[in-house]
Interface confidence: low
């Protein structure tokens, strides 16, 4: 496809999400001539670069080339030679790089630093590497749902996501969960805000929108096991941890410096008698919701409502799209339907986790045992936080959709973000010809 | 009981033109997309063309994209095909099915209506 | 475009038999795939959605699976009726793909 003539003008954006896991880099295009309308850039790849989140080479910074080279490469097979130059570049990274900021400023900014040279070195037109914040990252998931699911505007739309293809322009809400933190975005019924570090004004193809939004630090998936076991082992009475989030069965060996190693754990952090302990599985889910719980305080709440940690937390309203890890989890767990109840879900976690081990790795022989291990603390997590941390009823729970892509574009915030970056989000609603826009996001 | 029913097939000459409907029965027609699939004989399924609940989405193959135009009549619960300028390679088996994202994609289809194109 | 690519293209097996059919999407398609059988007049079923769902009346011997980009349709123990051919369809996004089909017999 690289020398073929285009039909019509194309042009395409590149952003790069360096999660706390992993990288993700995303290929967008849209057509030249309608690049303010809603519902037109859509996704034509996805990379994943090989290797943990950019946060773990900060003591291998000479590497992080390498590590990127696939997927830019990748980039460059797939946009025409044509439209390199003129194509942007955004790296995002996300709770990470704010964790490794917190524990060091100068260490985040080195590693920042060396992503940005190595993204230099392409033909493209590079715009920069940043450490999103966690408000933006909240903001730009619930804009890139909205944006592919046209409910920014009336016109017609080029892609279908049929249930939700109703006249009704009510925005979805947007549950993103990744690595480190996890974010909850969505517009209340209510328009004055009792936190205003929770609200956002957005004006959008002429309408506005009242958003609320938090980002959790240290309550994503991965950071949030951190979590669990650190508080769990502070009662354990030698270095042996019977871990009902994990299957009857399963065993693993844990460096207490790793333990400790992530901030999202220094409140946990006590001198043990030993410098390994072993988990070892019991499969059990209601052991292992009740063990979930105690990472969230509820006991204080400054505002009318809180989700958890005293943050404040408006009621719930509409429908909402929950993504990234959410849909990975819980699409493994195959409970993703509509169909299925809240009940349903957790009937089918608790007979999930009980599972043997040995059982578990026969039946899903092609998955890292890494990540299959932790699909039982990952289903349990996600239940807990929906239901007692964001307050999700077994009636409300319909009104969560668990969303991989939208007609082939991931949901995530990278779209939203390159959305706003290019002023492809005007303020005003576009007329029939292109207007000279001021005001976006 | 959901019912799609295809008709209208026949034998036509290359270059002529054909329209065929599905009548839907059994459910609610326009809370569905609906999609038209085609298998030419001893082939596979090829997909030919996706119209919304709405009719405001659309979508075709490529293999027929300019020739044949899906449309459709939520008050008469019927989907429409109108296929023109065909080629002998438009002959085959035209099945209609519905859809609705999650779990009801592509989950009912009709018996099919045969289309011959030849001289 | 995703390519689907679907193994065997026939299958001679025998009632009881397990047989296994495979797809391999050639873009990730995140699960969105449905598995299709169709019988000799021409009658299209759907078996599966979402890679591993089975739908309402169809009997437990038929199951889906995933492995990162490879799905696979397993039936159990073979009966006379699941002689038949087989289809699996990507709807990750447009435009839909079939895989080439698999025509399962009795030997």
């Known amino acids: 496809t690289q020398n073929k003539a285009l039909p019509e003008n194309i042009k395409y954006g590149i952003v790069l999400d360096a999660g706390s896991s992993h990288t993700s880099l995303y290929i967008y295009k849209w057509p030249a001539e309608k690049e303010n309308d809603t519902g037109v850039v859509h996704q034509v790849e996805e990379c994943r670069v090989k290797g943990p989140g950019i946060s773990k080479y900060v003591q291998k910074v000479n590497e992080i080339g390498i590590y990127l080279t696939d997927c830019m490469e990748r980039a460059r097979e797939v946009i025409p030679r044509s439209q390199h130059q003129e194509t942007p570049v955004y790296l995002g990274a996300t709770a990470g790089m704010r964790l490794l900021r917190m524990e060091s400023e100068e260490l985040a900014d080195r590693v920042l630093d060396v992503v940005e040279r190595s993204l230099s070195n392409y033909p493209f037109d590079f715009q920069g590497a940043r450490i999103i914040t966690g408000q933006e990252e909240g903001a730009y998931g619930w804009i890139t749902i909205n944006y592919l699911l046209g409910k920014f505007s009336q016109k017609t739309r080029w892609f279908s996501i049929v249930p939700y293809e109703t006249n009704n322009q009510e925005t979805f809400g947007a549950l993103d969960l990744g690595g480190a933190s996890t974010q909850i975005t969505f517009v209340p019924q209510n328009q004055t805000t009792e936190s205003p570090d929770n609200a956002l004004q957005f004006r959008l193809y002429g309408k506005d929108y009242n958003v609320y939004t938090h980002s959790f630090l240290c309550y994503g998936k991965d950071q949030a096991l951190w979590q669990k076991l650190a508080k769990d082992i502070q009662v354990a009475s030698n270095e042996i941890l019977r871990d009902p989030c994990f299957h009857p069965g399963y065993k693993k060996v844990v460096n207490v410096s790793d333990l400790y190693k992530t901030p999202c754990t220094k409140r946990f952090e006590m001198t043990l008698p030993f410098q390994q302990f072993e988990i070892q599985g019991i499969g059990n889910y209601q052991q292992c919701h009740q063990s979930v719980l105690e990472l969230f305080n509820t006991s204080y709440c400054p505002y009318s409502q809180c989700a958890f940690n005293g943050i404040f937390l408006p009621p719930l309203q509409g429908d909402f799209g929950a993504f990234s890890a959410f849909y990975f989890v819980m699409n493994f767990l195959n409970l993703t339907s509509e169909k299925v109840s809240q009940e349903k879900v957790t009937e089918m976690m608790k007979k999930f986790c009980s599972q043997p081990w040995e059982e578990i790795k026969t039946s899903y022989a092609g998955v890292k045992e890494k990540y299959l291990s932790e699909y039982c603390f990952s289903g349990t997590y996600i239940l807990s936080l929906l239901l007692q941390g964001y307050h999700f009823t077994a009636d409300s729970w319909e009104h969560i959709h668990f969303i991989g892509k939208i007609q082939g574009s991931d949901a995530g915030w990278t779209l939203g973000y390159m959305l706003n970056l290019t002023n492809m989000i005007p303020a005003e609603q576009p007329l029939s010809t292109p207007l000279s826009h001021s005001t976006y996001v | 009981e959901v019912q799609l029913v295809e008709s209208g097939g026949g034998l036509v000459k290359p270059g002529g033109s054909l329209k065929l409907p599905c009548a839907a029965s059994?459910?609610?027609?326009?809370?569905?997309?609906m999609h038209w699939v085609r298998q030419a004989p001893e082939k596979g399924l090829e997909w030919v063309a996706y119209?919304?609940?709405?009719?405001?989405?659309?979508y075709y193959a490529d293999t027929v994209k300019g020739r044949f135009t899906i449309s459709r009549d939520n008050a008469k619960n019927t989907l429409f095909l109108q296929m023109t300028s065909l080629r002998s390679e438009d002959t085959a088996m035209y099945y209609c099915?519905?859809?609705?994202?999650?779990?009801?994609?592509?989950?009912?289809w009709g018996q099919g209506t045969t289309l011959t194109v030849a001289s | 475009d995703i390519q689907m690519t679907q193994s065997p293209s026939s299958l001679s097996a025998s009632l009881g038999e397990r047989v296994s059919l495979t797809c391999r999407a050639s873009?990730?398609?995140?699960?969105?795939l449905i598995w299709l059988q169709q019988k000799p007049d021409g009658t299209i079923k759907r078996l599966i959605y979402?890679?591993?769902t089975l739908d309402s009346g169809v009997p437990k011997r038929f199951s889906g699976n995933r492995s990162g980009s490879d799905y696979s349709l397993t039936i159990s123990s073979l009966e006379s009726e699941d002689f038949a051919d087989y289809y699996c369809?990507?709807?990750?996004?447009?435009?839909?793909?079939f895989g080439g089909g698999t025509k399962l017999e009795i030997k």
């Open positions: 099915a519905r859809d609705l994202y999650y779990d009801h994609v592509l989950d009912y």
């Open positions: 059994g459910f609610t027609f326009s809370d569905y997309g």
């Open positions: 119209i919304s609940s709405g009719s405001s989405i659309i």
């Open positions: 873009q990730e398609i995140s699960g969105y």
């Open positions: 979402a890679a591993s």
């Open positions: 369809l990507q709807y990750a996004s447009y435009p839909r793909t």
